[in-house]
């Protein structure tokens, strides 16, 4: 684009219009997680509300066992929260013994999988360590990105630990994506 | 939609068309707070910036006293980023002194209140326990999602502690919504 | 609106409509930094894959030196991620020590350069003390908000250590901006 | 506490307006949402209207909206209900209401009787 | 509008029956709320979104449904509950009730 003017951004309409009201949404709201047996160094995934208090889908956004389905290729916002709770991480002890103080971490990724690839996609990841004084702790890890996907992918929150979850309130941990 | 594809999109527009710049949008930016009196056991709510600098609010979103008020039906993005800053919080003098250690705690929620429901609803809640070592803390509470709302609903950010709320930048402290 | 109803929102169209598909939109991730010179007192800028793994631009929307370039006046959506990663702060040790404590911090800056205002304009900012006790301590810092943007403006993310961020995963450290 | 006071002409001659105000005590009334509703003789109740007093957004009963204006008074703390071109089936109570925060909150009434 | 149809008009139960009243809609609303009015006096909240108790609501009140039926119950009749009930719908323009469920001691 050097030396060059932009183009009139009304020659650039390359798309068929469509009504807002009409796209794929959906937000998803927690609710207790029963424990699922998930495979080593693989985090589990939460499973989520879709239809009562705040949480709902429209427009063909599906949600099922424990995934987003995505029925219409497109990019999408996409976006989560999770409220971690827990006793304090015994790093502090740790250090004071002298060992090697490795911290603990809470850790939340938007993962995508896809026909197209066999592995699935990280879209976005939120790491903390978490070495805390008090004895009880709590705090949210916060994700949101736009991404390309394509008809037919699953979308899905996986988290470190999801005893840590608080699972408490549907406004302290939700997952949601919308095209854009 | 199990064993069936996807239907396509262009039989899919059920609304109207609209154009994107007459959609309600609002970015509001922090300004120094005056003490309000607010009921007990209820967040005291943020007051905002809502036309200088980087603040706008366009398409009949409008802000009056604290609100956010929504002038037409649809699905809204909402954020918010609340910055706080304080002295350390006692916890580590407390738990050294072997009492038992409730940390302190600072927390953000975005409150919906609505004439169709005789209660204010909490959309978004990010709340983080505090318990620092050093002397002088300061970090961001960022919270953002999608919502159904109605004609007439009205947005406020409440906070746990309003004296802790950092107001010196208007790139610190904001809220925002936007029809998509 | 003193004493009337919202207007019908079908009366409100002034702007002409445009197909979603083709707006400006970019996804950018994190790549190793190499050391560039800075001005004392200024951020460093982060620099960025825009093509490979999640990373696109698209629409006009152009990546180049660090800045994406707006390519059409309008309301943008701008996010960014950012993990850090490092060794203790001292802060607990100062302050057994009984010196004076300024605790170490972490900032993210999303800034915007106009040829309108000679300043960068500073649009969000997120800061955060860090005082940890564990010895390796890891944390991300998001920011998202809307802003009016003008044809030509340019986006940078600027962090005040730019050796402590984590540049190892895509998913980790990340820069966003689409048009409303 | 929390307190909602009706208070206008208990008589009104048929097609005069009835005019009512309700004093808001208690709480900030922009928080919430101050609506209007009547109770006629040995009826229903019968929902007129409501004000968001934080931007003066109305809305109004289809079946009253031609004769009905809400107004409201944040100096005063009040809000204010105007029916035009009563006739004797206006003879109601007519209660003030807050909602939006609960408990939602009710004044005792006003008995407003149209007659000439 | 939405047509609130609340059965039955009036009832007669002994103390300690336990009284159930519905409430019907003309079409599905997400909320639905009940009043209590005794003689003389204003309405009172007794359930909000359809199955809330409003704060200092004896718990003997109860409310369930959802889309276009809805109930309201008081397990154990106490001669205080001498009222006319309503039921609510807050969603649609107007605001509408039911016309009231008269209850009586035997």
């Known amino acids: 684009l050097k030396g060059q003017e932009f183009a009139p951004s009304h020659q650039q309409v390359y798309a068929p219009l469509r009504a807002d009201g009409d796209k794929p949404r959906a937000h998803l709201t927690v609710v207790r997680q029963t424990p699922t047996q998930h495979f080593k160094n693989q985090f589990p995934a939460l499973h989520w509300e879709h239809e009562l208090g705040l949480a709902f889908t429209k427009n063909r956004m599906n949600y099922t066992n424990k995934f987003l389905l995505i029925p219409e290729s497109g990019d999408y916002f996409i976006y989560s929260q999770v409220t971690f709770r827990g006793m304090t991480s015994e790093c502090s002890e740790i250090r004071q013994a002298g060992r090697p103080n490795k911290p603990d971490s809470i850790t939340v990724v938007i993962t995508k999988v896809t026909d197209s690839y066999p592995e699935p996609t990280q879209l976005l990841m939120g790491t903390k360590s978490v070495c805390e004084v008090g004895s009880n702790w709590f705090q949210p890890i916060y994700l949101g990105a736009m991404f390309s996907l394509q008809e037919g992918d699953k979308l899905m929150v996986n988290v470190s630990d999801i005893s840590l979850v608080d699972y408490t309130k549907e406004d302290k941990t939700f997952f949601g994506a919308f095209l854009l | 939609l199990k064993g069936q594809e996807f239907a396509p999109s262009h039989q899919q527009v059920y609304a109207p068309l609209r154009a994107d710049g007459d959609k309600p949008r609002a970015h509001l930016t922090v300004v120094r707070q005056t003490p309000t009196q607010h009921f007990k056991n209820q967040f005291p709510a943020l007051h905002w910036e809502h036309e200088l600098g980087l603040a706008f609010t366009k398409n009949r979103m409008n802000y009056t006293n604290k609100f956010l008020l929504i002038p037409e039906s649809g699905d809204y993005f909402i954020y918010s980023q609340v910055t706080f800053r304080g002295m350390t919080s006692e916890c580590s003098e407390i738990r050294q002194a072997g009492r038992p250690n409730k940390p302190d705690s600072i927390t953000v929620v975005i409150t919906k209140v609505t004439d169709s429901y005789p209660e204010p609803t909490q959309l978004l809640m990010g709340t983080k326990s505090v318990c620092e070592v050093g002397s002088n803390w300061f970090q961001p509470i960022y919270l953002g999602a999608m919502f159904s709302l109605q004609e007439g609903d009205k947005l406020m950010v409440n906070v746990s502690d309003i004296s802790l709320v950092d107001y010196t930048k208007e790139d610190k402290t904001f809220f925002g919504a936007f029809l998509l | 609106l003193k004493g009337q109803e919202f207007a019908p929102s079908h009366q409100q169209v002034y702007a002409p409509l445009r197909a979603d598909g083709d707006k400006p939109r970019a996804h950018l991730t994190v790549v190793r930094q190499t050391p560039t010179q800075h001005f004392k007192n200024q951020f460093p800028a982060l620099h960025w894959e825009h093509e490979l793994g999640l990373a696109f631009t698209k629409n006009r929307m152009n990546y180049t030196n660090k800045f994406l370039l707006i390519p059409e006046s309008g309301d943008y959506f701008i996010y960014s991620q950012v993990t850090f990663r490092g060794m203790t702060s001292e802060c607990s040790e100062i302050r057994q020590a009984g010196r004076p404590n300024k605790p170490d911090s972490i900032t993210v800056v999303i800034t915007k350069v106009t040829d309108s205002y000679p300043e960068p304009t500073q649009l969000l900012m997120g800061t955060k003390s860090v005082c940890e006790v564990g010895s390796n301590w890891f944390q991300p810092i998001y920011l998202g908000a809307m802003f009016s943007l003008q044809e030509g403006d340019k986006l940078m993310v600027n962090v005040s250590d730019i050796s402590l961020v984590d540049y190892t995963k895509e998913d980790k450290t990340f820069f966003g901006a689409f048009l409303l | 506490q929390v307190q909602l006071q009706e208070s206008g002409p208990g008589l009104v001659r048929p097609s005069q307006t009835l005019s009512l105000t309700c004093t808001v005590s208690g709480f900030d009334f922009q928080d919430t949402y101050m609506h209007w509703v009547r109770q006629r003789p040995g009826r229903g109740l019968e929902w007129m209207g409501r004000i968001d007093p934080a931007s003066e957004h109305t809305k109004y009963n289809p079946s009253l909206k031609s004769r009905v204006t809400i107004t409201r008074d944040t100096s005063k703390n009040q809000v204010s209900l105007r029916l035009s071109s009563v006739t004797a089936a206006d003879t109601a109570v007519y209660y003030c209401?807050?909602?939006?925060?609960?408990?939602?909150?009710w004044g005792q009434g006003s008995l407003v009787t149209v007659s000439s | 509008d939405i047509q609130m149809t609340q059965s039955p008009s009036s009832l007669s139960a002994s103390v300690g029956d336990r009284v159930t009243i519905t409430c019907r809609a003309s079409q599905g609303v997400r909320y639905m709320y009940w009043y209590q009015q005794k003689p003389g006096k204003a309405p009172k909240l007794l359930i909000y979104?359809?199955?809330n108790l409003a704060s200092g609501v004896p718990s003997r009140f109860s409310g369930s449904g959802s889309g276009t039926d809805f109930t309201f119950t008081i397990s154990s009749l106490q001669p205080e509950d001498i009222a006319t009930y309503y039921c609510?719908?807050?969603?649609?323009?107007?605001?509408?009730f039911g016309q009231g469920t008269k209850v009586e001691i035997k």
């Open positions: 609510q719908q807050w969603e649609g323009n107007p605001r509408t």
């Open positions: 979104g359809a199955s």
């Open positions: 209401v807050r909602s939006g925060g609960l408990p939602d909150v």
